[in-house]
Each structure stands twice: as C-alpha cells, then as structure tokens.
C-alpha cells in the first residue's frame, strides 16, 4: 500500500521518463545557481512537500537529490539564513520503512544525519546547518535541481 505522497512521487517520475529526450543542459538558466555539475533553484515561496515535488517537475527538474555529505555541505553553504528550511527529494517510504529518494534509491545511512523521526508522512528538509525530518504537510521552501551535461574536451587537429 503506497501513501499518497509515494504515489505522487512515482507518477511524476514516470511522467518525466515518458517525456521526449531534450538536448543536454550546458549552462544554468537565469535565476538558477550552479553547484558543480548541477543547477539549483532555491524557491522564495513555501509549499508542502508534494506541491514542491510537482513544482520542480513543471520546471523540467526534480527536487534536490544529494549524493553525499560533501554535496550537502556545499548546498548548505548557499543557504543565507539559519531560519530557512528547504525540502529536498527524500521522504519516508511506509511500504519499505526506509528513507527513499525520489529517483527510487534508498538513503545510505552514512550520507545524512537526520534529526527527527522516520515515520509515515515524514519528508526531509535541510537548513544552513542540519537535516531535519518534518511533516510533509508543512509549508516551507524547496530546492529544485537540473543536471548539467558534462562537456567533453574536443581535440582539434592542427590547422
């Protein structure tokens, strides 16, 4: 039995997979910030987690996926105040009783030190300093990401 949030996450991911292939992204769009091989958009408004998920999808992006602690720290360095919370693409899967990224992978327990409960209707937010489990219905800001396409160096013959 999937929760409504899990269904929403799966539906959006499937609809994204059905879309036609777009050319790779070489530069970040206006208002997006580059962080290594990603473009990040920090919202100024607030939403519950599932609305945030949907908003990123409409922007042809996804809620932020964090690979490791290093990426977390670099992302947190872009947050300007300690009293701002941002949703990321991680929520509690009731069926699998584990934290699950919206791309279907499970959280490696060493990646993020989550403060708070792992239970139904819990979603993950980040602040300038920490990672929190919050109720998914809470209206806070969110971070969307787009992957940048790596540009391979072309070798030109001498002219």
């Amino acid at each position: 039995q999937k929760s409504s949030i899990e269904k929403c996450s799966v539906d959006i991911q499937q609809s994204r997979n059905k879309t036609t292939e777009r050319p790779g992204l070489l530069n970040c769009p206006i208002y997006w910030q580059q962080l290594r091989e990603k473009c990040l958009l920090f919202s100024h408004t607030v939403n519950p987690w599932n609305n945030s998920l949907a908003d990123c999808s409409t922007k042809e992006s996804s809620l932020l996926l964090i690979r490791d602690k290093d990426e977390l720290i670099h992302t947190q360095n872009l947050i300007r105040d300690k009293a701002i919370l941002f949703w990321i693409g991680l929520n509690f899967s009731l069926s699998e009783k584990n934290w699950k990224w919206i791309n279907g992978s499970f959280l490696n327990s060493n990646d993020l030190e989550i403060r708070g409960d792992a239970k139904e209707n819990s979603c993950i937010s980040i602040s300038q300093t920490s990672v929190y489990s919050e109720y998914c219905s809470t209206e806070i800001r969110w971070i969307c990401q787009k992957e940048l396409t790596p540009v391979r160096n072309k070798v030109y013959p001498d002219s």
């Epitope: 300007r80 105040d81 701002i84 919050e134 109720y135 809470t138």
Partner: antibody, heavy 119, light 107 residues
C-alpha cells in the same frame, strides 16, 4: 477557528525559573513553526524564539540564548518556553504566535501571559 | 541585525482621513515585510504580509506597498476601530525584528 492560549505567567524573583505553555487548537499544529514574542510594559514587540513543526529545529534571540528553551509536544498540541536565570529585563507579556521560520509572518497570536521578574 | 524604523512615532487623524505609515529597513529585505495592528491590552493582529498581501478577513481599506528598504502601510479611510498602534516586522533574516510602532490617535 485557530486558537492559541498561553498560561504559566506570574511573579518570579531574579534568577528564578518559569515555564510558559501555549495550547493550540483549530489547525494541524505539527505542520506549523511556532514562536514566542514578548512585549515589555509600554514598549514594542520583541521576537524571542522559534521552533519548527517537528520540533527538530530551534533558534533564539541573543538576549535569551542559553537561558530560555523552546519546545513542543505535538501529541498535546502544546508549545512551551522554559525560562531560567530570569532578569528584571525579561518582564513582559509573552505571546505565542504561529510562524517564525522565514518567510513566515505571525498570522495568529495568543492573548498573552504576563511574566514579572522582581524581588 | 536588521533595524526597522517607523515614522511617524505617533499621529493624530480624524475618521475618514487617509493615513500613511512608513517603515524603513536598515538593509534590503526584498518584500519580506509584514504589518500588524495592536489595540491596548490585546494581542497584535496580522494585517499585511509580504509587503502588499492582505491577510484574510482584513478590510480592504488597508493596503501595503514597497520593496527593498522602504515600505508604506496606508489606511484609505480611517474608521473608529482603526485607532491603534501599528508595527512593521521583517521576515527576511534572523533575528526577526519589529519597528518601534506608530500610534494612531483621534484628533
């Protein structure tokens, strides 16, 4: 209807302690950040502390950091403020208010509870 | 910390008057500015959030404008129940700070 009702105020000696409570009803308490805001007699409003919906994240004004602790019990729909090492300048009406994480406004307020610190 | 400065500190006006209260931030706060009304012995009440959005249930004679550092609360036609103290507050950065208040009195 959203309601916030504070209690626990009173007269306390300098250096003493007091715990304020705020009972919330009419909304999904656990989904909202909450704050304490105070107002000294005849003065303006001063934000004191805030806590996230889950209670995992808290922050404080410099004037109370290390002396006051904000907490919440979502099963009881109640917000708390534990006040230790009280000073005369802490004398004020203490309001609990919904909101406090950026960019929230304080959209609902309790009626306030008076804390008097005096010997 | 961001300082919020209101002017005037107090004003006298008559019923039906148009009243404007200004609030200046010590640095840019974009549109993260809220206005509250407080009557003696009562809790503050949110009137305007995000500089210009009217809180639900608040009469349309109240309006807010501005962005960056300069903001204005306007009461288009003062009513007897509007005599109170008004506070601005920034929700751009911590600590959250309020203006010192503007008392609107009966002339």
């Amino acid at each position: 209807e959203v309601q916030l009702v504070e209690s626990g105020g009173g007269l306390v000696q300098p250096g003493g302690s007091l715990r304020l409570s705020c009972a919330a009803s009419g909304f999904t308490f656990s989904s909202y950040a909450m704050s304490w805001v105070r107002q000294a007699p005849g003065k303006g409003l001063e934000w004191v502390s805030a806590i996230s919906g889950s209670g995992g994240s808290t922050y404080y004004a410099d004037s109370v950091k290390g002396r006051f602790t904000i907490s919440r019990d979502n099963s009881k729909n109640t917000l708390y403020l534990q006040m230790n090492s009280l000073r005369a300048e802490d004398t004020a009406v203490y309001y609990c208010a919904r909101g406090g994480y950026l960019p929230d406004a304080f959209d609902y307020w309790g009626q306030g509870t008076l804390v008097t610190v005096s010997s | 910390d961001i300082q919020m400065t209101q002017s005037p500190s107090s004003l006298s006006a008559s019923v039906g008057d148009r009243v404007a209260i200004t609030c200046r931030a010590s640095q840019s706060i974009s549109s993260y500015l809220n206005w509250y009304q407080q009557k003696p012995g009562k809790a503050p009440k949110l009137l305007i959030y995000a500089a210009s959005s009217l809180q639900s249930g608040v009469p349309s004679r109240f309006s807010g404008s501005g962005s960056g550092t300069d903001f204005t609360l306007t009461i288009s036609s003062l009513q007897p129940e509007d005599f109170a103290t008004y506070y601005c507050q920034q929700s751009y950065s911590t600590p959250l700070t309020f203006g010192q208040g503007t008392k609107v009195e009966i002339k």
